[in-house]
């Protein structure tokens, strides 16, 4: 799996997004998690309503929020009100039995609220390498990264 | 209060086309998925086709693939249903249906009769 | 494809009586199960979701139970609005289908 980066500004929200296929993912919950460490478990965060037929209503923990168009295939996360410890690597998952399909990897990166004016520097994310450089933009707030960029394995 | 009136049916002969419409009002049109469900005479209900509230996403049974195509002007509150390659089991009463994106109906309309026959 | 099938296919009640109908998923739907009720020459209207939420409007006389792949719909006292045909509809596997149909008829 590739990674995709997507960043956003202290204090503010981030929504994440992660494509599918309709399909396939069918009748699937979804899941959005944090990776602990180089090969810890991928931690839940949160996933969609324990009812599949309602995944399309916004689910909440905390200041995370799911919510899943299963017609269109994309599964929509939101972190409110972003802060230096949100930055890391997530992933969005497609849950099926005791599995999970990794949909898309994710780092998450904090950019510094240009109108705060404290010295805390403009940047956090973790494992920060020279690869990141190379990731191409998406667009306005993600990029992707090459496969092998990021040294977690795949736990798809 | 949600309301969705469909019109179009006939009577069409074998291999003939025909265009369902679903006028809807009541609540935000582009916010839903839309489906056609029909029902065969004296029959149990079978879903046809959806679209997304977009317009974006598009899917059918496979009896009518490749020969229904469904549509919506969003700007009109409107939604459609061109059938060609019509064949005597594709007589049903049509109803278009609103729902959520796992195809739960939540409100239907009346329906409208398609007879192919020759 | 997923067969659901409905037991019985017509059932006789009284008006004032309980009426049990049974729907049957050829696999484990979870809870991902609406009910519809059609009355002669009407749409259909949906009832329950859920397996057992009722609908907004849907009265309290009408309840749904069960997971997996067993699951029942209960009118607990049948009014002469109820005489109708119900179906049961799955939803988690594509595409979505729905059982033949139980007719509940005045006995």
């Known amino acids: 799996h590739n990674t995709t980066v997507f960043q956003g500004v202290a204090g503010q929200s981030l929504q994440v997004s992660c494509p599918y296929d309709s399909m396939k993912h069918w009748g699937r919950r979804k899941a959005w998690c944090r990776q602990l460490g180089e090969k810890g478990p991928c931690q839940r965060v949160v996933s969609t309503h324990n009812l599949w037929l309602l995944s399309f209503l916004r689910r909440w923990n905390g200041s995370t929020a799911i919510t899943d168009d299963t017609l269109g295939g994309t599964l929509t996360i939101t972190l409110r009100n972003l802060q230096p410890h949100d930055a890391g690597l997530y992933q969005c998952q497609s849950l099926h039995g005791s599995e999970a399909d990794t949909l898309r990897k994710v780092l998450v990166e904090v950019l510094a609220d240009p109108l705060d004016h404290r010295d805390a520097g403009d940047l956090w994310f973790p494992g920060e390498s020279e690869s990141f450089e190379d990731a191409h933009v998406e667009h306005s707030i993600s990029r992707s990264l090459l496969e092998g960029e990021i040294p977690f394995p795949p736990t798809s | 209060e949600v309301q969705l009136l469909e019109s179009g049916g006939g009577l069409v002969q074998p291999g003939g086309s025909l265009r369902l419409s679903c006028a809807a009002s009541g609540f935000t049109f582009s916010s839903y998925a839309m489906s056609w469900v029909r029902q065969a005479p004296g029959k149990g209900l079978e879903w046809v086709s959806v679209?997304?509230?977009?317009?974006?996403?598009?899917y059918y049974a496979d009896s009518v693939k490749g020969r229904f195509t469904i549509s919506r002007d969003n700007s009109k509150n409107t939604l459609y249903l061109q059938m060609n390659s019509l064949r005597a089991e594709d007589t049903a009463v049509y109803y278009c249906?609103?729902?959520?994106?796992?195809?739960?109906?939540?409100?239907w309309g009346q329906g409208t009769l398609v007879t192919v026959s020759s | 494809e997923i067969v659901m099938t409905q037991s019985p296919a017509t059932l006789s009640v009284s008006p004032g009586e309980r009426a049990t109908l049974s729907c049957r998923a050829s696999?484990?739907?979870?809870?991902?199960l609406a009910w519809y009720q059609q009355k002669p020459g009407q749409a259909p209207r949906l009832l329950i979701y859920?397996?057992?939420t009722r609908a907004t409007g849907i009265p309290a006389r009408f309840s749904g139970s069960g997971s997996g792949t067993e699951f029942t719909l209960t009118i607990s006292s049948l009014q002469s609005e109820d005489f109708a045909v119900y179906y049961c509809q799955q939803l988690p596997y594509w595409p979505p289908t729905f059982g033949g149909g139980t007719k509940v008829e005045i006995k």
């Open positions: 249906a609103k729902g959520t994106p796992t195809l739960l109906f939540q409100h």
């Open positions: 696999q484990s739907v979870s809870s991902n």
């Open positions: 679209i997304s509230g977009s317009g974006g996403s598009t």
């Open positions: 859920g397996a057992s």
